[in-house]
Interface confidence: low
Amino acid sequence: EEELQVIQPEKSVSVTAGESATLNCTVTSLIPVGPIQWFRGAGPGRELIYNLKEGHFPRVTTVLDPTKRNNMDFSIHISNITPADAGTYYCVKFRKGSPDVELKSGAGTELSVRAKPSAPVVSGPTARATPEHTVSFTCESHGFSPRDITLKWFKNGNELSDFQTNVDPAGKSVSYSIRSTARVVLTRRDVHSQVICEVAHVTLQGDPLRGTANLSEAIRVPPTLEVFQRPMRAENQVNVTCQVRKFYPQRLLLTWLENGNVSQTETASTLTENKDGTYNWRSWLLVNTCAHRDGVVLTCQVEHDGQPAVSKSHALEVSAHQKEQCSDTTSGPVLAPTAPLGGSG
């Protein structure tokens, strides 16, 4: 009597999640009488996948009619494959008995499931940083298989090289996750910049997935200040202007001080946007030159985006001619009481 063989011709089969898989199995003899069963895994913890005699296996069907006489093909078809179906499947012949006795197993077919990575999610730093500083962006994508995956970072279309990537878990798994962190050095021109995380995987057929983050949420461009005075038509008034340039984000609080004492405070309202995405703002005071004491210093103090204040001071310049226009009895504050609390332009 020829010894029965259980033949599983494919060592491995690879399918994409959602598709169906066919696992082939033939036997070389009809005797001894007894059923065929399919298992995933080997040993005592193996999982029964298909039993011809009994049980309900909604996703598994036999390729040929198992009731047909002289049938020696016990291949099965598994529908709607998920990454959890990955593993090695064994076709096992039993000898009929009470109970049935395992007689011979096929060599096994490894089913690997190709699963698409999820759309990459890019997250930036929780706090803003200033130009010349390095910030980190993290990109995560999950649920892909096989483990091989390529991740690239771009800033405004230029590929970045300073990043580190981990794929977890390190060992075998039904699906994998990738986490990559890129370091980006900020420049003053980065308000409109964007970082892109690009993930390429065999399941994507050359059409990589992308996740993006805007550097506008990570950058703080501190303002530069300039204070200057201009004469007005009225001979006893000058306009002192504080020019706040090239700042981002918009949040700004400006305080005028006279010889160190707070004179007025205002928040930036009508801003001018520059091409690079930063903003400019101008605040001005009308100063009554007759009301000053010699050596008055006006200070423009700016708190930008909750950061420590920066300031620029200006010593009020009053010409001899302006002094001549003032009567000896003039007194009062340096700031003209009728002047608006500040303006923009």
């Epitope: 730093p125 706090a127 940083a129 910030v135 962006f137 300073d162």
Partner: antibody, heavy 122, light 112 residues
Framework: QVQLQESGPGLVRPSETLSLTCTVS????????WSWIRQPPGKGLEWMGF???????FYNPSLKSRVTISLDMSMNQFSLKMTSVTAADTAVYYC????????????????WGQGTTVTVSS | DIVMTQSPLSLPVTPGEPASISCKSS???????????LDWYLQRPGQSPQLLIY???NRASGVPDRFSGSGSGTDFTLKISRVEAEDVGVYYC?????????FGGGTKVEIK
């Protein structure tokens, strides 16, 4: 998942050299710092030093002159050597994995060995 | 070296009640990138330490959501919203901003 296992003698004589090895299984040595931390009986934790996958080492200055940490990528192992031991070096010695993402830095010592007790006594 | 100071030294707790542990550092652990380099670890009796919280407030994988970390700069807090019996042990904070890495002295949490 990744597991760490310390090995080495449980008893070392004073003035001799303590040698411990940590074997990494179930994962790669790449992209992590590999740390040694000790805990004297009834006391707190003390970081001794660590080594990155490229061989770069960082040591606790209080131990630096006596401690050497080395890496054997082929064996998936890293080792601790400490010279001139005294009774004060009696402790449980842990090896551990430190996650390190460039641009963020160290973000957690996430895998620890079960620890090995080393007694320094004559 | 950065010195880490934990309080209290010992914390008797009642199961189901909240608990809070403080950790102070001798210098700010908040870096310009916005991350606070502070981790929290739990060492159960007879076991190795395990990571609970990293970078100040991020829960490690598998850690129950009753654990939370907060704080910034030099003052940090670990909170347990409802203590369970399995939460007993010694809790350590550790700064990971610069080497040498330094641990707090530990807070022993025990059931009343």
């Amino acid at each position: 998942q990744v597991q760490l296992q310390e090995s080495g003698p449980g008893l070392v004589r004073p003035s001799e050299t303590l040698s411990l090895t940590c074997t990494v299984s179930g994962g790669s040595i790449r992209n992590y710092y590999w740390s040694w931390i000790r805990q004297p009986p009834g006391k707190g934790l003390e970081w001794m030093g660590f080594i990155y996958d490229n061989g770069r080492t960082f040591y606790n200055p209080s131990l630096k002159s006596r401690v050497t940490i080395s890496l054997d990528m082929s064996m998936n192992q890293f080792s601790l050597k400490m010279t001139s031991v005294t009774a004060a070096d009696t402790a449980v010695y842990y090896c551990a994995r430190v996650r390190a993402y460039s641009g963020i830095g160290l973000d957690g010592t996430d895998v620890w060995g079960q620890g090995t007790t080393v007694t320094v006594s004559s | 070296d950065i010195v880490m100071t934990q309080s209290p030294l010992s914390l008797p707790v009642t199961p189901g009640e909240p608990a809070s542990i403080s950790c102070k550092s001798s210098q700010s652990l908040l870096y310009s990138n916005g991350y606070a380099y502070l981790d929290w670890y739990l060492q159960r009796p007879g076991q190795s330490p395990q990571l609970l919280i990293y970078l100040g407030s991020n829960r490690a994988s598998g850690v129950p959501d009753r654990f939370s970390g907060s704080g910034s700069g030099t003052d940090f807090t670990l909170k347990i919203s409802r203590v369970e019996a399995e939460d007993v042990g010694v809790y350590y904070c550790m700064q990971a901003l610069q080497t040498p890495l330094t641990f707090g002295g530990g807070t022993k949490v025990e059931i009343k």
